[in-house]
């Protein structure tokens, strides 16, 4: 056999020889020879490698720092990293979720279009005509104005995006 210039999938070329890569969850201890296969060892506690590899050191699991508002969403294994998320009321500042910020509240005149999650902030929308919000909230949607007519009442004061209509009794005097 001629010395290889390229190797099969899950192999790597070293010293004119194709050696097996270490499987996920294991690190390289020594390259193969023509007499022995690649020597691999499992990653230790709190370490992982998520691909077929020739790494001599495993990666440390991500630390979900509670001081940054983080908590563990999914514990890491020898083959996967720990996944962090944010404490209730907080959300990640990036896709990597390395820190958290408080969910935004929607000001009066705005309602919650989409409630925040551990990875996305609150989405607010202006209250359209016929709707209002009189509180600053991370949960409240815009509420529809009260329908005075259904209560046999009349509008005494028009509603705005921040206030409900004020209903009053109908004027009993008729011309």
């Amino acid at each position: 056999p001629e010395p290889p210039t390229a190797c099969r999938e899950k192999q790597y070329l070293i010293n004119s020889q194709c050696c097996s890569l270490c499987q996920p969850g294991q690190k390289l201890v020594s390259d193969c020879t023509e007499f022995t296969e690649t020597e691999c060892l499992p990653c230790g506690e709190s370490e992982f490698l998520d691909t077929w590899n020739r790494e001599t050191h495993c990666h440390q699991h991500k630390y979900c720092d509670p001081n940054l508002g983080l908590r563990v969403q999914q514990k890491g294994t020898s083959e996967t990293d720990t996944i962090c998320t944010c404490e209730e009321g907080w959300h990640c500042t990036s896709e990597a979720c390395e820190s958290c910020v408080l969910h935004r509240s929607c000001s009066p005149g705005f309602g919650v279009k989409q409630i925040a999650t551990g990875v996305s902030d609150t989405i607010c929308e202006p209250c359209p005509v016929g709707f209002f919000s009189n509180v600053s909230s991370a949960f409240e949607k815009c509420h529809p104005w009260t329908s005075c007519e259904t209560k046999d009442l009349v509008v005494q004061q028009a509603g705005t995006n921040k206030t409900d209509v004020v209903c009053g009794p109908q004027d009993r005097l008729r011309a």
């Epitope: 056999p1 020889q17 020879t33 023509e34 296969e37 020597e39």
Partner: antibody
Framework: EVQLLESGGGLVQPGGSLRLSCAAS????????MSWVRQAPGKGLEWVSG????????YYADSVKGRFTISRDNSKNTLYLQMNSLRAEDTAVYYC??????????WGQGTLVTVSS | DIQMTQSPSSLSASVGDRVTITCRAS??????LNWYQQKPGKAPKLLIY???SLQSGVPSRFSGSGSGTDFTLTISSLQPEDFATYYC?????????FGQGTKLEIK
């Protein structure tokens, strides 16, 4: 036809030296890793040493490290084992073998080394 | 070094019998194991490589299995020429090491 023929065995005193040869034929010698395996009388097999093909890396069992040297001459299609500081426990039949895919697919008939005073 | 332990050390069987020889490694060697047959006064012969692959020219009555630390060599129907000594050999760690051998004798 692949053939491996060992020579150079014999009786030697403790502390003495011996050089074993293995003449190869029937295949492209330079393309294969080669090794020496020994078998003490009435005992099992023991891998002694190996030499790579292209890189020519050498490997030894702990029991012979520092005393034995494996080498090859691709122009002569010959494998060698230089054995120094021989001990009684080195007494064995020494086989040369061809390696392919981590297995020894062809073996010589063996040569007997006896270390005794 | 990795220790390879074969069992039994010797075994008596008859022609036509199904025979199993086991080999245990002192630590995991994945499927990096070979089996050899040796007859008295002869050089060993490679039977099985990579735990379960049959070497070219070896009869199909020979088979191998196992991975990690426990391996078996099975002869499905013993033939007269199968009476010999069998060795396992690991190549998962340097140096390669052999089991002590299992002598298969005629009952």
């Amino acid at each position: 036809e692949v053939q491996l023929l060992e020579s150079g065995g014999g009786l030697v005193q403790p502390g003495g030296s011996l050089r074993l040869s293995c003449a190869a034929s029937g295949f492209t010698f330079s393309s294969y890793a080669m090794s020496w395996v020994r078998q003490a009388p009435g005992k099992g097999l023991e891998w002694v040493s190996g030499i790579g093909s292209y890189g020519g890396g050498t490997y030894y069992a702990d029991s012979v490290k520092g005393r034995f040297t494996i080498s090859r001459d691709n122009s002569k299609n010959t494998l060698y084992l230089q054995m120094n500081s021989l001990r009684a426990e080195d007494t064995a039949v020494y086989y040369c073998a061809r390696y392919v895919n981590f297995g020894m697919d062809y073996w010589g008939q063996g040569t007997l080394v006896t270390v005794s005073s | 070094d990795i220790q390879m332990t074969q069992s039994p050390s010797s075994l008596s069987a008859s022609v036509g019998d199904r025979v199993t020889i086991t080999c245990r490694a002192s630590q995991s060697i994945s499927s990096y194991l070979n089996w050899y047959q040796q007859k008295p006064g002869k050089a060993p012969k490679l039977l099985i490589y990579a735990a379960s692959s049959l070497q070219s020219g070896v009869p199909s009555r020979f088979s191998g299995s196992g991975s990690g630390t426990d391996f078996t060599l099975t002869i499905s129907s013993l033939q007269p020429e199968d009476f010999a000594t069998y060795y396992c050999q690991q190549y998962g760690r340097n140096p390669p090491t052999f089991g002590q051998g299992t002598k298969l004798e005629i009952k």
